[in-house]
Amino acid sequence: QRFAQAQQQLPLESLGWDVAELQLNHTGPQQDPRLYWQGGPALGRSFLHGPELDKGQLRIHRDGIYMVHIQVTLAICSSTTASRHHPTTLAVGICSPASRSISLLRLSFHQGCTIASQRLTPLARGDTLCTNLTGTLLPSRNTDETFFGVQWVRP
């Protein structure tokens, strides 16, 4: 029990449990389809322990297998709107370093206004994850509708 208490007092990152849960800050200017994220206790239910934000993009600090998850809800959206706007897609990938650039998730909204997905994937220190939303609808900034996070699972 004493060990468990001591363990609870250690910072998560010292245990290798890098984790981040982010909320949407803003979209980029035109020709920049990236979503820009923010996180921290002052913002409510978002946090970063280990990974960090670099100009709104999530950068990994520890090698390992991560669970990456994301949910995006389109603002002012109905099923009719969503089907009309079928080009709207969300992609999550490693955008830097360029040598490791790869798409990890690609999702289309089709008939719905919300997409949510997750996957396990190896990530390395220095990897920056970008989330690109293309189409002609804006994402909701409500924290229970649009969020993005990673969780270190194992080396």
């Epitope: 979209t27 009309r84 189409g135 002609t136 804006l138 900034r141």
Partner: antibody
């Protein structure tokens, strides 16, 4: 009926800012995106950006990024478009237009002529 | 950006004529194309959306067709009130772009 009523004509000096208003009526203000489009004298239509009145989020055309700001006052169902660092080539009629849910603009405001001249 | 090219840029026609205006997109935009009519000193008015759907209240002499990159607006029998400038608009992706306009004049 659905109506968008814009503020009156403005004359500004180069380097100044202008703030154009667009008052919506006849529908639920927060349920539709609003766009801003401008038209220089004798020229075509140029899209400036999209605004979400429900949460204030925006997406601006690259050309105007850093100079344009779109805001709203939900109590009066009014959207504002502010353009800063004005230059003579910003002389144009500025229109607000409601997005009817298909990135289709209907109706449009009557337009606001902004003249930039020293 | 997706470039929209309209032709012709101006056109003279007579009442009763059949007129066709074309709009070409620089890349595939599916059917994400609208047509607007603008009269001098007035705001544009929506005529056709989704390339071929007629907006409510617009006379049936207006029709639209096309998909992919090539689109047309046809006025089957010109009326005096149809003399105006017509714009196509792509709504496939941001930034939204318009054609340069086609000015329809009385011959």
């Amino acid at each position: 009926q659905v109506q968008l009523v814009q503020s009156g004509a403005e004359v500004k000096k180069p380097g100044a800012s202008v703030k154009v208003s667009c008052k919506a009526s006849g529908y639920t203000f927060t349920s539709y995106y609003m766009h801003w489009v401008r038209q220089a004298p004798g020229q075509g239509l140029e899209w400036m950006g999209i605004f979400n009145p429900s949460d204030g989020s925006t997406s601006y055309a690259q050309k105007f990024q850093g100079r344009v700001t779109m805001t709203r006052d939900t109590s009066t169902s009014t959207v504002y478009m502010e353009l800063s660092s004005l230059r003579s080539e910003d002389t144009a009629v500025y229109y607000c237009a409601r997005d009817v849910g298909e990135t289709t603009f209907d109706p449009w405001g009557q337009g606001t002529l902004v003249t930039v001249s020293s | 950006d997706i470039q929209m090219t309209q032709s012709p840029s101006s056109l003279s026609a007579s009442v009763g004529d059949r007129v066709t205006i074309t709009c070409q997109a620089s890349q595939d935009i599916s059917n994400y194309l609208n047509w607007y009519q603008q009269k001098p000193g007035k705001a544009p008015k929506l005529l056709i959306y989704d390339a071929s759907s007629l907006e409510s209240g617009v006379p049936s002499r207006f029709s639209g067709s096309g998909s992919g990159t090539d689109f047309t607006l046809t006025i089957s029998s010109l009326q005096p009130e149809d003399f105006a400038t017509y714009y196509c608009q792509q709504t496939n992706s941001f930034p939204i772009t318009f054609g340069q306009g086609t000015r329809l004049e009385i011959k």
